[in-house]
Structures are given as structure tokens and as C-alpha cells.
Interface confidence: medium
């Protein structure tokens, strides 16, 4: 037998950071340690997310908002809300089941995460290769062969390497 509730649920008065405590006559009680409620009218508080193992705390939990995690150095976040940490690789590599592996010839990766992608095929746009690709960098396409003056080479030596971590804009 459930008592008829008044038109306004008394729990709706409980603000974020509290919960409606049925054991105490529906009084608004503060969330206990290591828990939070981000909206009003909650009947329980949620246990704070814990950033354990390869996760580290980016933002501490408060009574009104959950903790946020990121990854320890050498790892990067994956998934909504950083639900996973994936190992970093070097530029010019990709992560496989067997660890970091160099990009195959004809592919590149200019980041510490993600997969190796094929070099741009300049000829599809009717252009020629201006700068050769490497494991870390895509090719740079130049003008179409028809635009080149007679005797001009369509391939120039690779540009000097940039500092690590600077991706082309």
C-alpha cells in the first residue's frame, strides 16, 4: 500500500549534491563521501567514477559532478568520457595487437595514435608529387605536370624534418 503523494513530490525540492532520504522522512541529505548527484530530486547519489590503473584524475569528484579521468603519460583517451586508455606509438607507427609497428611503405601516421593511412595519390587530382612521403608525413602534391616548365622535375627532395610533434596544418 503506497501512501498518496501530495501533488508536488517532496523529493523534487532536493537540490543537486543531495538525495531524497527515504529512511529519514524524505529529508534532503547531502551525498555521502565519494558520491554525487548532478541533478535535483535524486533518490540516491551515484558513486564517483574512480580513475585507476592507467587512468589518472583530470577533475576531482564533487558532490554535484562526477570525476573526470584522462590517461597517464604514454597513453591517450579513447571512447566517450575517456572510457579507455590506449598506448601511444611514435609518429610513423600504428598500434597493432602485437604492439607498435612501423607504417608500411606507402602509408604514414603523423600522430602518436590512430592508424597508418595511405599517401595521397597526386595523380588522381592530375597533379604530380612535389615532396615524397615518409612514414611520418604524407606526400605533398605539386602543380599538374602540364603546368611545369620544360625540364622541371616533378619530384623535389624531401623537406627538412620538422620538430617531433608538429603536424602539418
Amino acid at each position: 500500500f503506497e501512501r498518496t503523494r501530495s501533488l508536488q513530490d517532496p523529493c523534487s525540492n532536493c537540490p543537486a549534491g543531495t538525495f531524497c532520504d527515504n529512511n529519514r522522512n524524505q529529508i534532503c541529505s547531502p551525498c555521502p563521501p565519494n558520491s554525487f548527484s548532478s541533478a535535483g530530486g535524486q533518490r540516491t547519489c551515484d558513486i564517483c567514477r574512480q580513475c585507476k590503473g592507467v587512468f589518472r584524475t583530470r577533475k576531482e569528484c564533487s558532490s554535484t559532478s562526477n570525476a573526470e579521468c584522462d590517461c597517464t603519460p604514454g597513453f591517450h583517451c579513447l571512447g566517450a568520457g575517456c572510457s579507455m586508455c590506449e598506448q601511444d606509438c611514435k609518429q610513423g607507427q600504428e598500434l597493432t595487437k602485437k604492439g607498435c609497428k612501423d607504417c608500411c611503405f606507402g602509408t604514414f601516421n603523423d600522430q602518436k595514435r590512430g592508424i597508418c593511412r595511405p599517401w595521397t595519390n597526386c595523380s588522381l587530382d592530375g597533379k604530380s608529387v612535389l615532396v615524397n612521403g615518409t612514414k611520418e608525413r604524407d606526400v605533398v602534391c605539386g602543380p599538374s605536370p602540364a603546368d611545369l616548365s620544360p625540364g622541371a622535375s616533378s619530384v623535389t627532395p624531401p623537406a627538412p624534418a620538422r620538430e617531433p610533434g608538429h603536424s602539418p596544418q
Epitope: 565519494n34 540516491t44 585507476k52 592507467v54 579521468c69 597513453f75 572510457s83 598506448q87
Partner: antibody
Framework: EFQLQQSGPELVKPGASVKISCKAS????????MNWVKQSNGKSLEWIGV????????SYNQKFKGKATFTVDQSSSTAYMQLNSLTSEDSAVYYC???????????WGQGTTLTVSS | ENVLTQSPAIMSASPGEKVTMTCRAR???????LHWYQQKSGASPKLWIY???NLASGVPARFSGSGSGTSYSLTISSVEAEDAATYYC??????????FGAGTKLELK
């Protein structure tokens, strides 16, 4: 001897709700978190969530938010899980499991078989 | 979520044989938070190995666990008939991130 005694099998109709109980004995109920785990058709295990019996605070696997609700009755050392809007996908064996620390489960109930069928 | 892939799905061994099953994580798991459970047909799971290499109470010494990062394994040095069961690995990355592998079923010849 530690024991987690779960309620008996349930046969319910689609759209209905069910409340499964897990009575703890042999240890201080409020000293250990209580987890709930789903096992569908002899397949793998899925963590549904956890309740801290001392405070009543909860944490749910995102997949089960809105589907499962945990409560406890400290006076009878019993944890409850209510499952609502049941469909055939919810047919499974549900276990309660105690965690001495947050990350593993040292004692499990015998399981409650839920069958959702019209 | 951090998916755990167990291999092989099913394995068959003769008594006395050494067997190893693996658990691979999609992303790195702290060795403190990687655990194994044994489940026999029709029974509840039992904690078997916790924190990668610690045997739970009552687990025979022929069982061992090892690993780090994304690769973990459970080894039985000399299989006995009573070891026939399904073994699940489980990882914890802080609430609400707890996942299990799909299990390795060990059958005896």
C-alpha cells in the same frame, strides 16, 4: 560461513517488472559493496552495477542505467535489484556478488533465473 | 569499454598436460586490476586468481597467473579432471568500468 542467498526463479511477462533479492549472512553486510552481474544463456558475464550498503550509493554500467535499480535493507542484510520494462533480452541468470575491495568479487550468490515470456 | 578477448574459446587437454589460456585487453589494464574466475556447469562463478597472480583461497598451486599491460594468462601446470570449467578474466578501470572476457572453456579428454 559467508553466504549470499538469492530469491528463486522468476517467470514474468514482457513489459512487467521484477525484484530479485540477495540476503547476506556470515559477515557485516555494510562493510562490503554488493554487485549485480548478468549471465545470458550460459554466455559471458556482464557487470550491471554496484551498491554501497552503508550509504545506498550506486554505480551502474551505462548499458543498464534505467533498466536496473539497486536498493538495500540494512535491517535484514538484503540487497535488491529491480528490473523494469522487461523484454526477452532480459532473460538470464542474475548473480549478486560481494566485493571486499572495489575491483573483484570474492563471493557470489547461487543465481536467480529470470525468464521473460508471454 | 575495455574489451577483453580470451583465447582459445574452447580447449581440450589430457590429465597431466600443461595448459595456458590468454586474456588480451583492447587497452592497457593495471596488473592489480586483472582477475580470473572459474565457473563449472550449473554453478556460480568463483574467484580464482586476483590481481594477475594471486591464488584465491582454496585454489590448487598448479594454477598460476601472469601478464601485464594488455596481455595476461592463466596456466595450469598439470591439468586434473576437476579443472574442467570455463575461466573468465575480468578487469577494473574504476567505477563504472568493469568488464569480463567471453571465457575459455577447458574440456578434458
Amino acid at each position: 560461513e559467508f553466504q549470499l542467498q538469492q530469491s528463486g526463479p522468476e517467470l514474468v511477462k514482457p513489459g512487467a517488472s521484477v525484484k530479485i533479492s540477495c540476503k547476506a549472512s556470515g559477515y557485516s553486510f555494510t562493510d562490503y559493496n554488493m554487485n549485480w552481474v548478468k549471465q545470458s544463456n550460459g554466455k559471458s558475464l556482464e557487470w550491471i552495477g554496484v551498491i554501497n550498503p552503508n550509504y545506498g550509493t550506486t554505480s551502474y554500467n551505462q548499458k543498464f542505467k534505467g533498466k536496473a535499480t539497486f536498493t538495500v535493507d540494512q535491517s535484514s542484510s538484503t540487497a535488491y535489484m529491480q528490473l523494469n520494462s522487461l523484454t526477452s533480452e532480459d532473460s538470464a541468470v542474475y548473480y549478486c556478488a560481494r566485493s571486499p575491495v572495489e575491483d573483484y568479487f570474492d563471493y557470489w550468490g547461487q543465481g536467480t533465473t529470470l525468464t521473460v515470456s508471454s | 569499454e575495455n574489451v577483453l578477448t580470451q583465447s582459445p574459446a574452447i580447449m581440450s587437454a589430457s590429465p597431466g598436460e600443461k595448459v595456458t589460456m590468454t586474456c588480451r585487453a583492447r587497452s592497457s589494464v593495471s596488473s592489480s586490476y586483472l582477475h580470473w574466475y572459474q565457473q563449472k556447469s550449473g554453478a556460480s562463478p568463483k574467484l580464482w586468481i586476483y590481481s594477475t597472480s594471486n591464488l584465491a583461497s582454496g585454489v590448487p598451486a598448479r594454477f598460476s597467473g601472469s601478464g601485464s599491460g594488455t596481455s595476461y594468462s592463466l596456466t595450469i601446470s598439470s591439468v586434473e579432471a576437476e579443472d574442467a570449467a570455463t575461466y573468465y578474466c575480468q578487469q577494473y578501470s574504476g567505477y563504472p568500468l568493469i568488464t569480463f572476457g567471453a571465457g575459455t572453456k577447458l574440456e578434458l579428454k
